[in-house]
C-alpha cells in the first residue's frame, strides 16, 4: 500500500520488486550507433577492439560524439523518450555520432541491483572512449554523455574512470534513491567532466525523491523549482484515464528533464533561460532575475560552460509542454498604506499590456506576508512574448488568513455597517524582464488617484519621466 | 526479407494453456524486441507483452500478467506466448510483432494464430 | 493506461478523395503514435510511426500529423486497395495501447 507520502509510495514499492529475468552470459553493455532517425534501422553495434563497424557505420571521427544513457528499467525495453532524444540530436547536429548506451540487461534488475551496476557499466563506456582516444582525429573534448535518471551517475563513472577529461556531461533528472549526499565519487559530480549541466524536475523534500536534490554539476538547473511540473498534477496526467496509476504523474516529472532538453534541441529559437538563485523560494519572489556576472544561463543543450561556478543552482517557470519557453518577470509593487484592512491579506492581480501581445491575469504568489509602507517583489510570467510592456492592469482581493479571521471581520462588518471600504495604495510598479535585462517604472495613470479596492482596477502606464528610476542606468545584458 | 511464422491454429478447453511460437528471419532476432498482440472477433487489438530477445527480459499488460508468459529461444530465433487458464473471452487472433528499435511500432507482423476456447 | 479514441467507427468516402481519419489519446502522448491498416483475415500493416514519420514501400498518399492528444492520418486520393480498418496506437507508456479502429468503405 502507498506511503503517506502519496506518489513517491507506489512507486517506493516498484523500486523494490523483484523481478523475473532469465539471464544470460552476453555482453551486458553494447554501443549502437544510431546511423539513421528511421526507428526501424537497426544502427550498428560498436565493438571493443573492432575497427571496421566504424569504417562500415561511416563513424565521423572528427564530430562531435554523444552517449545517450538509459536508467533503471521495468520493462527491459526502451521507453519513448529515447527515439525522441536520437531523433533531436540528429536534427541538430547532422554530422555527429550518436550512440545508445544499451545497459538493459543489467538496468532490468531490482533497482538496488541496478544502482550496483552503475559502476561497471561507467567502466564499459569508459574502456570504449579509451579505446576511441587512440584513434587518430578522435577527441574526448568532442564527447558529450547524456544520461538520464539512474545513467546520469553511470556517465559520472564513466567521466571519472576515463583517460583524460571528457567535453560534457549532462545530467537529466539523476537518480536520487541511493545517491543523496553519497560521496563526490560515488554519484555524478562536477570533476567528471569539463562540463556538467544537470536539470533536476522530479525533487522532494519529503517522501522519495525520485530524482536527487542537491547540486551535482556545474550548474544545476531546477525548473519550476525542481519539483511539481507543470502539466503533470494528477488531473492533467490521470485525465480520462480508465485505470490511470500514480507511476504516471511520476514518470511525467522525472522524464520532463528529457523533454527539456530535446526542446532545447529542436526549439532552438525559443530558449529557455535560467537564473542563478540560492532557493526556490527566493526565485518564486522574483529577487534573482540578474544575468549579471554570468547569473543567467540557457538551460539544456544551448547551456553556455561556466567551469568557473560549482554547485550553481538556477531556477526558471516552463510551459506544461514544448516549446517550454516562458518569459520572466520581476515585479517590485510599493504598498504606500493600508485602509480598515483588519486582519485580510490582500492577493493581487495582474494583466499585461504589451505591444504584440496581452497577458491573461496573472495572480500574483505570495511567498511572505505583503508588507506595507514596503516594497514588495514578485515574479510573474507569460506563455507568450507580449513584446515591450505600455501598460498593467492590477486588481485584488482580500484573502482571509483563517476562520477565526473571517468571522471578526465579518462582526466587525455587522457592528458597524457604514464602515468605509478597505483600500490599499500603491503609486507605481517595477517591472524588469528575465528575459530582456530591461528594467521599467509603470505610474498610476492617475496620480490623484492611486488607492485601490478589492475587485477594482487600477491602470498603470509607462512613468513619463523615462524607461527607468534614476539610480537604475544599468544598461541591458546581453544573454548568453 | 524479414518473416514471422506463428504456429498453427488452437482448439482448447476452458482453463487448459495454449502456447504460440513465432519464428524469425531475415534479421538479427536479438536486436529488436517481440511482441504479442491479440484481436478477439470484432474488437481493437489489445497489447499483452513483449520480450527482449537478447537477454529475455520481460514487460506484460496488467491485465494478462498472472496468465501469461512470453519467453524465447535465440539459438532458433523464436518467441513463444503461453496463456493459461483460459477462457472463452480468449478466444481470438494472436499475433507476434517486431518492434522497431526503440521497441515502440510493430512493422512486421505475424500471420496470426487462431486460438478457439470452448467447451 | 492511455485510452485511444478513434471517433469515427466508420467512414464513407468516394475512391479518388481525401479521407481524414482521426485518433484522440486521454492524455499527452507526444509523437508516440502509430497508424496501422488491416484487411480482413490480414494481419495489420504500419503505415506511419512515431505520428509523422513514413515507412520505406508505403504509398506516399498516406500521411500523418498531430502531436500530444491529437492525430491525424490523411490518405490524399483514396485508392479501391485503400478501404480497409484503420487503427491507431501508442508508445508513450505501458501498456501499449489500440484505438478501437476506424472502418473506411466505399461511399
Known amino acids: 500500500s502507498p506511503t503517506p507520502f502519496g506518489p513517491e509510495g507506489q512507486l517506493a514499492d516498484e523500486l523494490h520488486k523483484p523481478k523475473a529475468i532469465q539471464t544470460e552470459v552476453k555482453p551486458s553493455v553494447r554501443f549502437n550507433l544510431r546511423t539513421s532517425k528511421d526507428p526501424e534501422h537497426e544502427g550498428c553495434y560498436l565493438s571493443l577492439g573492432h575497427s571496421q563497424p566504424l569504417e562500415d557505420c561511416g563513424f565521423n571521427m572528427t564530430a562531435k560524439t554523444f552517449f545517450i544513457i538509459h536508467g533503471w528499467t521495468m520493462s527491459g525495453i526502451f521507453e519513448n523518450w529515447l527515439h525522441k532524444l536520437v531523433s533531436a540530436l540528429h536534427t541538430r547536429e547532422k554530422d555527429a555520432n550518436v550512440v545508445v548506451v544499451d545497459w538493459l540487461p543489467l538496468a532490468h534488475q531490482l533497482y538496488t541491483d541496478a544502482v550496483n551496476n552503475t559502476r561497471v557499466v561507467g567502466h564499459s563506456i569508459a574502456r570504449m572512449l579509451d579505446w576511441l582516444q587512440e584513434k587518430d582525429d578522435f577527441s574526448l573534448g568532442n564527447v558529450h554523455l547524456i544520461g538520464y535518471s539512474l545513467g546520469a551517475h553511470v556517465a559520472g563513472y564513466a567521466g571519472n574512470f576515463v583517460k583524460g577529461t571528457v567535453g560534457r556531461i549532462t545530467g537529466l533528472d539523476p537518480a536520487g534513491p541511493m545517491f543523496e549526499g553519497a560521496d563526490i565519487h560515488k554519484r555524478l559530480s562536477p570533476d567528471d567532466a569539463d562540463f556538467v549541466d544537470v536539470l533536476h524536475t522530479y525533487t522532494r523534500s519529503f517522501g522519495l525523491s525520485i530524482g536527487i536534490q542537491m547540486p551535482v554539476g556545474h550548474i544545476d538547473i531546477y525548473p519550476n523549482g525542481g519539483d511539481f511540473q507543470p502539466g503533470c498534477g494528477l488531473n492533467d496526467v490521470l485525465g480520462s484515464m480508465a485505470y490511470g496509476t500514480i507511476t504516471e504523474v511520476v514518470k511525467c516529472e522525472h522524464e520532463r528533464a528529457v523533454h527539456l532538453f530535446v526542446d532545447s534541441l529542436v526549439n532552438q529559437d525559443k530558449p529557455s533561460f535560467a537564473f542563478q538563485c540560492t532557493d526556490s523560494n527566493r526565485f518564486k519572489k522574483g529577487i534573482c532575475l540578474s544575468c549579471r556576472k554570468n547569473r543567467c544561463n540557457s538551460i539544456g543543450y544551448n547551456a553556455k560552460k561556466m567551469r568557473n561556478k560549482r554547485n550553481s543552482k538556477m531556477y526558471l517557470k516552463t510551459r506544461a509542454g514544448m516549446p517550454f519557453r516562458v518569459y520572466h518577470y520581476q515585479m517590485k509593487i510599493h504598498v504606500f498604506s493600508y485602509k480598515n484592512m483588519g486582519e485580510i491579506e490582500p492577493t493581487f492581480y495582474v494583466t499585461l499590456y504589451g505591444t504584440n501581445a496581452d497577458s491573461q491575469t496573472l495572480p500574483l504568489e505570495i511567498v511572505e506576508r505583503i508588507e506595507q509602507n514596503a516594497t514588495n517583489t514578485f515574479l510573474v510570467y507569460t506563455e507568450e512574448d507580449l513584446g515591450d510592456l505600455l501598460k498593467i492592469q492590477l486588481t485584488w482581493e482580500g484573502a482571509s488568513q483563517s476562520w477565526y479571521n473571517l468571522w471578526k471581520e465579518l462582526r466587525s462588518y455587522l457592528s458597524q455597517p457604514h464602515n468605509p471600504g478597505r483600500e490599499l495604495n500603491i503609486r507605481r510598479i517595477r517591472v524588469k524582464s528575465g528575459e530582456t535585462q530591461r528594467k521599467l517604472t509603470f505610474c498610476a495613470e492617475d496620480p490623484e488617484n492611486t488607492s485601490i479596492s478589492p475587485g477594482r482596477e487600477l491602470w498603470f502606464r509607462k512613468c513619463r519621466d523615462g524607461w527607468r528610476m534614476k539610480n537604475e542606468t544599468s544598461p541591458t545584458v546581453e544573454l548568453p | 526479407q524479414v518473416q514471422l511464422v506463428q504456429s498453427g491454429a488452437e482448439v482448447k478447453k476452458p482453463g487448459a494453456s495454449v502456447k504460440v511460437s513465432c519464428k524469425a528471419s531475415g534479421y538479427t532476432f536479438t536486436d529488436y524486441t517481440m511482441h504479442w498482440v491479440r484481436q478477439a472477433p470484432g474488437q481493437r487489438l489489445e497489447w499483452m507483452g513483449g520480450i527482449n530477445p537478447y537477454y529475455g527480459g520481460t514487460t506484460y499488460n496488467e491485465k494478462f500478467k498472472d496468465r501469461v508468459t512470453i519467453t524465447r529461444d535465440t539459438s532458433a530465433s523464436t518467441a513463444y506466448m503461453e496463456l493459461s487458464s483460459l477462457r472463452s473471452e480468449d478466444t481470438a487472433v494472436y499475433y507476434c510483432?517486431?518492434?522497431?528499435?526503440?521497441?515502440?511500432?510493430?512493422?512486421?507482423w505475424g500471420q496470426g494464430t487462431t486460438v478457439t476456447v470452448s467447451s | 493506461e492511455i485510452v485511444m479514441t478513434q471517433s469515427l467507427a466508420t467512414l464513407s468516402v468516394s475512391p479518388g478523395e481525401r479521407a481524414t481519419l482521426s485518433c484522440r489519446a486521454s492524455?499527452?502522448?507526444?509523437?508516440?503514435l502509430h497508424w496501422y491498416q488491416q484487411k480482413p483475415g490480414q494481419a495489420p500493416r504500419l503505415l506511419i510511426y512515431y505520428a509523422s514519420q513514413s515507412i520505406s514501400g508505403i504509398p506516399a498518399r498516406f500521411s500523418g500529423s498531430g502531436s500530444g492528444t491529437e492525430f491525424t492520418l490523411t490518405i490524399s486520393s483514396l485508392q479501391s486497395e485503400d478501404f480497409a480498418v484503420y487503427y491507431c496506437q501508442q508508445s508513450n507508456s505501458w501498456p501499449y495501447t489500440f484505438g478501437q479502429g476506424t472502418k473506411l468503405e466505399i461511399k
Open positions: 510483432a517486431k518492434g522497431d528499435y526503440y521497441g515502440g511500432s510493430y512493422n512486421y
Open positions: 492524455q499527452d502522448i507526444s509523437n508516440s
